[in-house]
Interface confidence: low
């Protein structure tokens, strides 16, 4: 009869390398009498005999993992016990080897030039895969802007136009290589004007071509503005090549103007725009133009900026050597004189003087200034500035103000066109339209009785006689 013998493990467990989905086997050969009970643990947790992922054979000496998963990685131990002596144990590691797998592949990206782009590429594998990137057909080199992060993602700082293209990431270890699908990095570039239109000084009736070139991604659209409004006449030719748009506006010049080229492109829900402007001035006026004694142009001064209608054309009198400068100087001088008048009078007088010195202008073959409507002139003279006007009439019969060399005539109201006869032939003063709704007291006038009132006022505000010819409604 055999003598009892304590268990001895004759083949200690070794480290086992296994690929995912392959079979892995641990051998735990035991010599003992009587036959031992052999149990298995993974990371100190007992493996149950009925677990279908495992096969335990040869009286428990052989543990087979039927289809290895990456979660099977760990320390496996066999323990043998037959009641004689102590239990014995041997342990070995299972290293699950895994070909590279891209778990979060890169996706198509649209990014605005100058911002930061990150293309993801998260991988799995054992040994840990190294990640590299391919742009187009070539390996991508890292530099101060371009880096492959620890996670495998590609980060591009301060994205440039040349970064646009097709990218893929490559995950590689000793067991194999995995490639992501190709993704596209699109770099959107704010609209920018490469070539601004040039200003021209031409003769009346000339043809002029204004050229504006812009770049952007997507390719910008170009629109043209003439004196603040969409160009009403002229032909536009456009040519697009390599993200650059070239727009040419051909004009027949009958008046000076400010022409603005506006390049626009869209980035998601937002737009970017770039603007460039050029002036077209008329050098030699034809006979008919000379007879008009002036031209229409946008007001570019500062004194009347708040008074004149924004972006409207005003009349410049060519009897002055430099009309814009001269008229600005006249109004500047008048402005200083107006500091002395009453708060009621001053804004009305400013509106009157600005609209008289810079009259609204109808362009065309013969530029025509549009005088102030008689009713508005009389409202300033006899209502808003009655006291001041009377005081000045003692000094001069033709104007309000005298300053240094400059005598500033105000219009003779009686000679102005009435808005009732032809509303399109004269200019209204918007300030007075607004003010008539807000005036509650007028200066008392004892020396003369005005011939005009602003209608629709509360009954208590005025007892002036109303002449229907001068009514402003």
């Amino acid at each position: 009869e055999k003598l009892p013998k304590a268990p001895v493990i004759t083949t200690p467990l070794e480290t086992v390398d296994a690929l995912v989905e392959e079979v892995a086997t641990f051998m735990c050969a035991v010599e003992s009498y009587p036959q031992p009970e052999i149990s298995w643990t993974r990371n100190k947790i007992l493996i149950k005999l009925f677990d279908t992922r495992y096969s335990i054979r040869e009286n428990g000496q052989l543990l087979t993992i039927l289809s290895v998963e990456d979660s099977d990685d760990g320390i496996y131990c066999c323990t043998a016990n037959n009641g004689v002596g102590g239990a014995v144990e041997s342990c070995g590691a299972l290293q699950v080897k895994m070909k590279p797998k891209i778990t979060r592949p890169p996706i198509n990206v649209k990014i605005i030039e100058g911002l930061k782009a990150v293309l993801p590429c998260t991988t799995m594998g054992n040994p840990k895969p190294s990640v590299s990137w391919i742009k187009g057909d070539s390996a991508l080199r890292e530099n101060s802007r371009i880096a492959v992060l620890e996670s495998g993602s590609l980060r591009i700082h301060n994205v440039q136009k040349e970064d646009a293209g097709q990218y893929r990431c490559v995950a590689k270890n000793s067991l194999g290589t995995a490639y992501s699908k190709l993704v596209k990095l699109e770099v959107e570039v704010f609209a920018r004007i490469l070539r601004a239109p040039e200003s021209h000084n031409v003769t009346f009736g000339s043809f002029v071509t204004l050229r504006c070139t812009a770049i952007g991604m997507p390719v910008p659209t170009i629109s043209w503005i003439e004196n603040g409004n969409a160009v009403s006449s002229g032909s536009i030719q456009e040519n697009v090549k390599d993200r650059v748009i070239d727009s040419r506006l051909q004009l027949f010049i009958t008046k000076p103007g400010l022409y603005t080229c506006i390049a626009t492109n869209k980035h998601g829900e937002k737009f970017s725009t770039a603007k460039a402007a050029a002036t077209v001035s008329i050098a030699e006026w034809s006979k008919s133009q000379k007879e008009s004694k002036g031209y229409c142009a946008q007001y570019r001064g500062e004194v009347c900026d708040a008074v004149l209608v924004k972006d409207s054309l005003v009349f410049f009198n060519t009897s002055y050597p430099d009309p814009e400068e001269a008229q600005e100087l006249l109004i500047h001088t008048a402005w200083n004189e107006l500091k002395a008048v009453s708060p009621l009078c001053r804004p009305a007088a400013e509106a009157l003087l600005c609209n008289h010195l810079f009259q609204e202008c109808s362009p065309g073959v013969l530029p025509t200034p549009m005088p102030i409507c008689r009713e508005y002139c009389l409202a300033v003279k006899e209502l808003f500035c009655a006291k001041e006007w009377l005081a000045m009439e003692g000094k001069t019969h033709r104007g309000l103000y005298r300053s240094g060399m400059h005598f500033l005539p105000v219009p003779e109201c009686s000679k102005l066109p009435s808005m009732h006869q032809d509303p399109t032939a004269c200019t209204r003063l918007p300030y007075l339209d607004y003010k008539k709704e807000n005036i509650t007291t007028f200066p008392s006038i004892t020396s003369s009785k005005p011939s005009v009132d602003i209608p629709n006022l509360p009954a208590s505000t005025s007892s002036f006689a109303v002449s229907p010819a001068y009514s402003m409604t």
Epitope: R192, S272, T273, A274, G301, E302, V303, D305, E325, E328
Partner: antibody, heavy 121, light 112 residues
Framework: EVQLLESGGGLVQPGGSLRLSCAAS????????MSWVRQAPGKGLEWVSA????????YYKESVKGRFTISRDNSKNTLYLQMNSLRAEDTAVYYC??????????????WGQGTLVTVSS | QTVVTQEPSFSVSPGGTVTLTCGLS?????????PDWYQQTPGQAPRTLIY???SRHSGVPDRFSGSILGNKAALTITGAQADDESDYYC????????????FGGGTKLTVL
Amino acid sequence: EVQLLESGGGLVQPGGSLRLSCAASGFTFSDYGMSWVRQAPGKGLEWVSAIPWQGGSTYYKESVKGRFTISRDNSKNTLYLQMNSLRAEDTAVYYCAKRSGRIAFGALDAWGQGTLVTVSS
Amino acid sequence: QTVVTQEPSFSVSPGGTVTLTCGLSSGSVTSSNYPDWYQQTPGQAPRTLIYSTDSRHSGVPDRFSGSILGNKAALTITGAQADDESDYYCGLYSYSGSKNYVFGGGTKLTVL
């Protein structure tokens, strides 16, 4: 050659006044906007005030509004900055600078050498 | 209150390229801010380099260029030279409420 020469700086007590002048030459002064820019010792540039070619409007940094007045005399080719109610924080080199065009806010394309204003008791 | 931001300092190797930026504390810098760039060496008056985003001032070498990158104005110096070591300021036209002109805090550029 464009030349801008500032003068009028010096030591003044808090609450006091100074008037800076800038004499311009080498260009048609009346055709250009002008500005004053200052720089506190060891600090950066700070825009103070601007005036267009004809002087009709004036523009100021918020902290100097009501205390400083910019003006120009085109006949004398001179720009001025009247500084009242001076404070210690107004201590700086004050530069006169020419704008690139008539408007008050074109680029600053020519600079003087600066004049030092020290506000201290 | 318009605050214009610049990198306090930057360094570049001789012959290298550097891009200085100029941003707004709230919102983006656009061509409507007409970004201007100025260079100042210690003890000297500023000198204009770039105006209205990308126009080079007369006499300025073409190593200096201006642009808008994303939401900031940028000054790029290519082929940096020892005498480019200076303070660089950007200036922006601001029109929030009232017209004014605001300088950034400046960037001290060191050419190593």
